[in-house]
């Protein structure tokens, strides 16, 4: 059986696959997924290994029309480095010489300057090029190699291994060499895989059942450390509760060097955030941190300094802490917008069982603003999801120059932010450089400001506008209002009407359904339309909603189904990557972010059309 990293190299023109007959003969044969000799896999960013021989594809020289055969894998050899060129060409790195079928006289696969159909290769059974099944470095744990990546294949006691092994062990623990010759270099680490006993790599907090892995002997950059945690279905550490910090202070007390945690300010337009999307509500900075020096965007926990946090350059090499298991957040169920009949008094705006109102003109200090909201039967607003924030920005009449009190504050316990309405903190969205909590002026209250409505801590005594929120009163069955310019069941936003397509459909089916409604799969022109759509679909239980974006027409170039320029994107992390496909919006914790899916997957969708009676604004000229 093929494991997910292995593939057959297929030439569509001949309908045949590459076959490693022997190390000196790499030819083609009728494709057979059970033949070991036809299985290959990437073993570094640029090397392809034959699974049968545990040797790498290479050439004797970078010249036209030489045979491609198998060599002992050598990550430094220029003659074993391959790269995908445009579309389905595979070439030797840095040259216009391609992996080629050969010809009638030449049965062997050859290196050739021609880029025609005989030089075009796909993964058998797919339409993808060979790089779509690319190499993913596997970071080791413990051992003696400072967390370096596995080197496949590696030699141990004169035998080659292309995977983690338990050779030399009687307990089944899986390990790998971190250089190609363990026998000479003696460098190794344990693999971040599940095996009997691997749970002893983790410390479980008996109070919360959350597990932590302290990798104090590793030396990785922040991004590498994060990848290592993710390879174990975990994330870099987030700390949202005082108890959690206390537990980790104890766990790391015998250590001295800094350890990466998930806190970072890598997002271009927002502030400090946890990589696992936990809310940043508890602060434990080392005095003098976070320093405002550019580039110091990642955070380490300092065991030698009472486990306090310090921001550093992300390329520094440190140990790290991973976290997995039940989140430390209280379970707090936010009702989906469609589940709650929402009736609000005049001048209040309904959303997901609550009513909201901006008080912009009567500026008040935080304490007085809170009193006013409570007199009106509510509280300063709490915000629990990106959808709720996007509702406030896109539909409450929020303005880019607003600075408005919300209910978040750390008045009760310093450096521990809570909502004034007592609801749990499940979400935060800080402005770049925030929360700054400047010591020379007590910044215990929080405002929403700027075009995106992100947050900043502020001295509570400033007179500002504020946002109130209260529970709505249910009044029997909800009356479906027909919005002006839109048909029944459609929702209006600015000049457009939107409708959720409730049938699970492929991208093509969804597009057709929208067309049948004299509409099209939604385009997303800017941050504000994105905010509206996030609040429109983000709380729904389905995972994805199709948009009109895809690279069906030209691989690698994403276009809307209607002739409109792509002027705004909102990709999820690691997207769009190299995957061709169609774009859907995520819901839930990654609400609104765009993922590339296979176009024949089934999802719900959003249709869009011009509202009636709206004058089309002129198209922007470029």
């Amino acid at each position: 059986l093929l494991d997910t990293r292995q593939f057959l190299i297929y030439n569509e023109d001949h309908k045949r696959c590459v076959d490693a007959v022997s190390p000196s003969a790499v030819q083609t044969a009728a494709c057979n997924q059970d033949a070991e000799s036809q299985k290959f896999r990437w073993v570094s960013e640029s090397q392809i290994m034959s699974v049968a021989f545990k040797l790498c594809l290479g050439v004797p020289s970078k010249t036209d029309w030489v045979a491609i055969t198998l060599y002992a894998c050598d990550s430094k050899s220029e003659f074993q480095k391959w790269e995908c060129k445009n579309d389905t060409l595979l070439g030797i790195k840095g040259e216009d010489l391609f992996f080629n079928y050969g010809n009638r006289q030449e049965k062997n696969i050859m290196l050739y300057k021609g880029s025609g159909l005989w030089s075009r290769w796909k993964i058998y059974g797919t339409t993808d090029n060979l790089c779509s099944r690319g190499y993913e470095a596997m970071y080791t744990l413990l051992g003696n190699a400072n967390g370096a990546t596995c080197a496949f294949p590696f030699k141990f006691e004169n035998k080659w291994y292309a995977d983690c092994t338990s050779a030399g062990r009687s307990d089944g623990w899986l390990w790998c060499g971190t250089t190609t010759d363990y026998d000479t270099d003696k460098l190794f680490g344990y693999c971040p895989l599940k095996f009997e006993g691997s749970e002893s790599l983790w410390n479980k907090d008996p109070l919360t059942s959350v597990s932590y892995q302290i990798n104090s002997k590793s030396a990785l950059t922040w991004h590498q450390a994060r990848k290592s945690c993710q390879q174990q279905n975990a994330e870099l550490l987030s700390i949202t509760e005082i108890h959690e910090q206390t537990y980790l202070t104890g766990l790391t007390s015998s250590l001295t060097s800094g350890l990466w945690i998930g806190l970072n300010s890598l997002s271009f337009n927002s502030g400090w955030q946890w990589s696992d999307r936990s809310p940043f509500r508890y602060l434990n900075w080392l005095p003098g941190s976070p320093s405002a020096e550019p580039g110091k965007s990642c955070v380490s926990l300092n065991p030698g300094k009472n486990a306090k946090w310090e921001n550093l350059e992300c390329v520094q090499k440190l140990g790290y802490i991973c976290k997995k298991g039940n989140t430390t957040l209280n379970s707090f169920v936010i009702p989906s917008e469609s589940d709650v009949p929402t009736h609000c008094p005049s001048q209040w705006w309904p959303y997901a069982g609550h009513c909201y109102k901006i008080h912009r003109d009567e500026k008040k200090i935080q304490r007085d603003a809170l009193t006013t909201c409570r007199k009106e039967g509510g509280d300063l607003t709490s915000i629990h999801t990106i959808e709720e924030l996007d509702f406030i920005i896109s539909q409450l009449g929020y303005e880019p120059n607003d600075e408005l009190w919300i209910g978040l504050n750390d008045i009760k316990i310093q450096m521990y932010f809570e909502w004034s309405d007592g609801t749990p903190v499940t979400f935060t969205k800080w402005l770049r450089g925030e929360p700054s909590h400047e010591n020379n002026r007590q910044e215990d209250c929080v405002v929403m400001k700027g075009k995106d409505g992100y947050w900043a801590d502020r001295g509570c005594e400033w007179p500002l506008g504020y946002i109130c929120k209260m529970k709505s009163r249910s009044q029997g069955p909800e009356i479906v209002e027909v919005e002006k310019g839109c048909r029944k069941g459609w929702k209006k936003h600015h000049f457009y009407c939107y409708m959720i397509g409730h049938t699970l459909s492929t991208f093509a089916e969804a597009n057709q359904t929208c067309n049948n409604e004299n509409a099209y799969l939604t385009t997303i022109e800017d941050r504000y339309e994105q905010a509206f759509l996030t609040s429109f679909v983000g709380l729904r239980p389905e995972k994805y909603f199709w948009t009109g974006l895809s690279d069906i027409q030209t691989k690698g170039t994403f276009q809307w189904t209607i002739e409109e320029e792509v002027r705004f994107t909102h990709w999820n992390s690691d997207m769009p990557g190299r995957k061709p496909g169609c774009v859907a919006m995520r819901t839930g914790i990654a609400g609104g972010l765009w993922d590339v899916l296979k176009c024949d997957e089934k999802a719900k969708f959003v249709c869009k059309h011009w509202a009636e009676g709206v004058t089309h604004p002129p198209k922007p000229t470029t």
Epitope: G143, S170, D171, F188
Partner: nanobody, 119 residues
């Protein structure tokens, strides 16, 4: 690297008792199992008792009910309490630790301690 030191062997009369201990030291991350073996003169080495990191135990049929294996995780030490000893228990007793350490090899052996059961 990893060192194992056994102690507690000696001469004992039949039906008497002895307590063997085996202490592991060195660069050990965790000990997944500790096992006692014995080898009588002219015979093959045989497993006597084993204990895992989680505390599960296993005994050879010939010692069940007479021998008890236990461990002290904090001290990286395993004990073998031997009661109702018989002359056929005479052997060199070896301790093996299955460890996670700074080499990929897992099995480390002690030098052995001699137990003689004789009147």
């Amino acid at each position: 690297d990893v060192q194992l030191v056994e102690s507690g062997g000696g001469l004992v009369q039949p039906v008497g008792s002895l307590r063997l201990s085996c202490a592991a030291s060195g660069s050990i991350f965790t000990i997944n199992a500790m096992v006692w073996y014995r080898q009588a003169p002219g015979k093959k080495r045989e497993e006597v008792a084993a204990i895992t990191r989680g505390g599960s135990t296993n005994y050879a049929d010939s010692v069940k009910g007479r021998f008890t294996i236990s461990r002290d995780n904090a001290k990286n030490t395993v004990y073998l309490q031997m009661n109702s000893l018989k002359p056929e228990d005479t052997a060199v007793y070896y301790c093996k630790a299955v460890v996670v350490t700074t080499t990929p090899y897992s099995d480390y052996w002690g030098q052995g301690t001699l137990v003689t059961v004789s009147s």
